[in-house]
């Protein structure tokens, strides 16, 4: 089979600070040295890119400085963290993995992780 399987959790609940973490694991059909990982958000039928990073196997995953994502990699597993989430960001987050080099190229699309974000209640005023 030439398809690349990507696994990710079905559901994740963001923290009260709007941070969600999940693992994206891929079954590499070949020995890739350069991998690109992209987080996509699917809302209705619209798909948008949340963040993306390319990394060399054995090296750290580096997102752009202004990215809302951070991550670490270990073998065929990527630990992804998305920050700054609000309730309106609740949705399906898809992990996309591309084995860029060496040939052949492979594409892997996960089934998506439903991230639930609940905005914290504002703290009531308190008298001291």
């Amino acid at each position: 089979c030439k398809a690349m399987h990507v696994a990710q959790p079905a559901v994740v609940l963001a923290s009260s600070r709007g941070i969600a973490s999940f693992v994206c694991e891929y079954a590499s059909p070949g020995k890739a040295t350069e991998v690109r990982v992209t987080v996509l958000r699917q809302a209705d039928s619209q798909v948008t890119e949340v963040c993306a990073a390319t990394y060399m196997m054995g090296n750290e995953l580096t997102f752009l400085d202004d990215s809302i994502c951070t991550g670490t990699s270990s073998g065929n597993q990527v630990n992804l963290t998305i920050q700054g989430l609000r309730a309106m960001d609740t949705g399906l987050y898809i992990c996309k993995v591309e084995l860029m080099y060496p040939p052949p190229y492979y594409l892997g699309i996960g089934n998506g992780t439903q991230i639930y974000v609940i905005d914290p209640e504002p703290c009531p005023d308190s008298d001291f």
């Epitope: 089979c1 398809a3 996309k96 860029m100 052949p104 699309i109």
Partner: antibody, heavy 118, light 108 residues
Framework: EVQLVESGGGLVKPGGSLRLSCAAS????????MHWVRQAPGKGLEWVSF????????YYADSVKGRFTISRDNAKNSLYLQMNSLRAEDTAVYYC???????????WGQGTMVTVSS | EIVLTQSPGTLSVSPGERATLSCRAS???????LAWYQQKPGQAPRLLIY???SRATGIPDRFSGSGSGTDFTLTISRLEPEDFAVYYC?????????FGQGTKVEIK
């Protein structure tokens, strides 16, 4: 408007060269991998070449390997195909196509005709 | 290389009838990586279905895709006059990207 517009096709003699261009507009070009696909008269679709986001990685069909070179200029939102040592069997309509975020080719240009004949 | 074989080569159908097109892969293709395109004479291909069964933006619901592994199907439930065209399947999970040879749907 989101679109791709090819140019550079024409009539060329066997052994000659041609450079095709594809101008992208209406989307963030650097966020997408791109392809060239061709279609010989009365025939089906044939994938020709692929280029990664930053242009560092390129893949080619065996039929064009060593003769065609794909490149991109993200600053100019443009994709290119340099075709050398052209043969009669390279005669086709050449399309540039965008890879959607989920993988299929969701945006195509109108095509440019390349005819290789003496 | 994954070889995609489409059948039939030509399908003659009357408007309003159902059309069923087949695409068989030489080896297993993940259902996430199979697409269908429509092409009319003188026009560029248009994406219809991706991920084997998801309709692309703006595609009417009379088009549906199904299948997994090596066998995939495109079904047009009720053919409209504008549906008479050539249809191609494609796998995009690994290089080289490959297309089927096409099925022409013509008016009976």
């Amino acid at each position: 408007e989101v679109q791709l517009v090819e140019s550079g096709g024409g009539l060329v003699k066997p052994g000659g060269s041609l450079r095709l261009s594809c101008a992208a507009s209406g989307f963030t070009f650097s966020s997408y991998t791109m392809h060239w696909v061709r279609q010989a008269p009365g025939k089906g679709l044939e994938w020709v070449s692929f280029i990664s986001y930053d242009g560092n990685h390129k893949y080619y069909a065996d039929s064009v390997k060593g003769r065609f070179t794909i490149s991109r200029d993200n600053a100019k939102n443009s994709l290119y195909l340099q075709m050398n040592s052209l043969r009669a069997e390279d005669t086709a309509v050449y399309y540039c196509a965008r890879t959607s975020l989920l993988g299929p080719f969701d945006l195509w240009g109108q095509g440019t005709m390349v005819t290789v004949s003496s | 290389e994954i070889v995609l074989t489409q059948s039939p080569g030509t399908l003659s159908v009357s408007p309003g009838e159902r059309a069923t097109l087949s695409c068989r892969a030489s080896q297993s293709v993940g259902s996430s990586y199979l697409a269908w395109y429509q092409q009319k004479p003188g026009q560029a291909p248009r994406l219809l279905i991706y991920g084997a069964f998801s309709r692309a933006t703006g595609i009417p619901d009379r088009f549906s895709g199904s299948g997994s592994g090596t066998d995939f199907t495109l079904t047009i439930s009720r053919l409209e006059p504008e549906d008479f065209a050539v249809y191609y399947c494609q796998q995009y999970g690994s290089s080289p990207w490959t297309f089927g040879q096409g099925t022409k749907v013509e008016i009976k």
